[in-house]
């Protein structure tokens, strides 16, 4: 008996398209395939950000794999060939393993990288990101900022930055149409007439940074002699009522009463007839249904009933 | 009041499939977070995933994909769990629940898989 | 995913004794811990949600603190119709998870 051998696939590179992260795996078909003309080779590939611990394998039948990776570090990759046993008349056959690494050469010592990156997704409507300048450099150093997701034709420089002293330190984004639900690559680069500055290299999902606006209209209804409901409104945006979670915050005579997380736009408090002032507060956040972070909304303005017997009244403000 | 009917017990096959309903009445169908959860005989809870009526939109507990298909019928207001390739690990209770907003469970399907 | 683990997995008293139930969470998941109770051939019923707030139609002997990763279910004055499982849930994040459960026994 013969050992059954396959090769490794050829010419096996990273491709980056220029999306600031989202790169193509690519290869060819090994040689010397002539003998499984009736097979389907498949192909095993995995790969990792330089400094990760685990690997991300896939099993494909087809030349080329896309994904996101952190262009601030390097990446690895390697493939090699599978003979399903079915092709072999007994176990599965593995060719060798091809390798491949891809990094962007930096310039630049990292000090210079813009430092504090922080985006928000105002309302889920618009982006905002914003940076402090790298450590020691000059004033003439200036940052640029590109972004990518998947549905723009190539990257796209900000067209609306946010200056100090004549320094960009932020962006302010255009409408992002169906940007949500997928990876948003950013790169901040620089220059300066003094030396080299840094890339840096950002990637996160919009929906998972949304700061909603705070709650409104809130409204006091006596239930009955010992229940208040309190009700608000979602804010005004593109926001559905399932996506909020809310936190209350309720004074009772200046005594913090309750803190409370909440699912739906109404609080039933149970009060005493002595309670001379009423206050509550309500801020949201978009929840797990909707996505897998976010950021809570400022609180509403304070509203409160004082003074007269609430019973007797609605309130609203 | 908000109540949930879920459909009677079943015995089958290992290597069928098995379909369950629950209907839901006194609340709005379409604006809440339908879950299914698992409970093997003796044991603890498992979430096995939810359908949102409103929009169709689906989230399964990654253990269970492949293994299960929810649907939901807007005119009826029912929404359904498809088991599929059944195997005595599928024996079990299963509950939908309304878990969001509202806390309401259905009395549970009682599925049971043999030869 | 993140794991509950509930203890004591069963705890046998007598009516009106005062029982505390714990639940530790694998990380930190702030308040969003809820406490269930089922009973031998029911559905579960919600007992508290958010680590501490009390569920319209429960008694006020059942209460519940906690934050981050370490939770308690506590019963004042335990009564008979309290026999049964206890389950703590998460919905922290995807998927929900439950904890094995603690068994209330009559001593």
């Known amino acids: 008996d013969t050992e059954i051998k396959v090769n490794p696939p050829q010419d096996f590179e990273i491709v980056d398209p220029g999306y600031l992260g989202y790169l193509y795996l690519q290869w060819q078909p090994p040689l010397s395939l002539d003998h499984f003309k009736e097979c389907t080779v498949e192909y095993e590939l995995k790969y990792r950000n330089i400094g990760s611990e685990t690997w991300k394998t896939i099993i494909t039948k087809n030349l080329h794999y896309k994904d996101g990776f952190d262009l601030n570090k390097g990446i690895e990759a390697k493939i090699h060939t599978l003979l399903p046993w079915q092709c072999t008349n007994g176990s599965e056959v593995q060719s060798s393993w091809a390798e491949t690494t891809y990094w962007i050469s930096p310039q630049g010592i990292p000090e210079t990288k813009v430092q504090d990156m922080d985006c928000v997704y105002y309302n889920w409507q618009y982006l905002l990101c914003s940076w402090k300048p790298g450590i020691g450099v000059l004033l003439d150093t200036n940052y640029n900022l590109f972004y990518w997701y998947e549905g723009l034709d190539h990257a796209l420089q900000c067209v609306d930055y946010i200056k100090a002293d004549g320094q960009n330190i932020g962006c302010r984004f255009p409408y992002l149409e169906a940007s949500d639900y997928k990876d948003f690559y950013i790169c901040v680069n620089g220059s300066s007439e003094n030396k080299p500055i840094r890339s840096s290299y950002f990637t996160f999902q919009l929906q998972n940074i949304v700061k909603p606006l705070p709650p409104v209209y809130l409204t006091f209804t006596r239930e009955s002699s010992c229940e208040i409901k309190l009700k608000w409104s979602i804010p005004l945006g593109p926001i559905p009522a399932r996506c909020f979670d809310y936190e209350i915050e309720i004074r009772e005579d200046d005594t913090t009463l309750v803190t409370a997380t909440v699912e739906n736009e109404t609080y039933t408090l149970k009060t005493t007839n002595e309670t001379r002032q009423l206050c509550f507060v309500v801020r949201s956040k978009v929840n797990i249904y909707c996505s897998d972070d976010g950021i809570w909304s400022e609180w509403s303005d304070k509203q409160c009933w004082e003074g007269e017997d609430l019973s007797k009244k609605t309130l609203l403000r | 009041q908000v109540q949930l009917q879920q459909s009677g017990p079943e015995l089958v096959k290992p290597g069928t499939s098995v379909k369950m309903s629950c209907k839901a009445s006194g609340y709005t169908f379409t604006s809440n977070y339908i879950h299914w959860v698992k409970q093997r005989p003796g044991q603890g809870l498992e979430w096995i995933g939810w359908i949102y009526p409103g929009d169709g939109s689906i989230k399964y507990n990654e253990k269970f994909k492949g293994k299960t298909t929810l649907t939901a019928d807007k005119s009826s207001s029912t929404v359904y769990m498809l088991l599929s390739s059944l195997t005595s690990e599928d024996s079990a209770i299963y509950f939908c629940?309304?878990?969001?907003?509202?806390?309401?469970w259905g009395q549970g399907t009682t599925l049971t898989v043999s030869s | 995913d993140i794991v509950l683990t509930q203890s004591p997995a069963t705890l046998s008293v007598t009516p009106g004794d005062s029982v505390s139930l714990s639940c530790r969470a694998s990380q930190s998941i702030s308040n969003n811990l809820h406490w269930y109770q089922q009973k031998s051939h029911e559905s579960p019923r919600l007992l508290i949600k958010y680590a501490s707030q009390s569920i319209s139609g429960i008694p006020s002997r059942f209460s519940g603190s906690g934050s981050g990763t370490d939770f308690t279910l506590s019963i004042n004055s335990v009564e008979t119709e309290d026999f049964g499982m206890y389950f703590c849930?998460?919905?922290?994040?995807?998927?929900?998870?439950f904890g094995a459960g603690t068994k209330l026994e009559l001593k």
């Open positions: 629940a309304v878990l969001r907003r509202l806390d309401y």
């Open positions: 849930q998460q919905s922290n994040s995807w998927p929900l998870t």
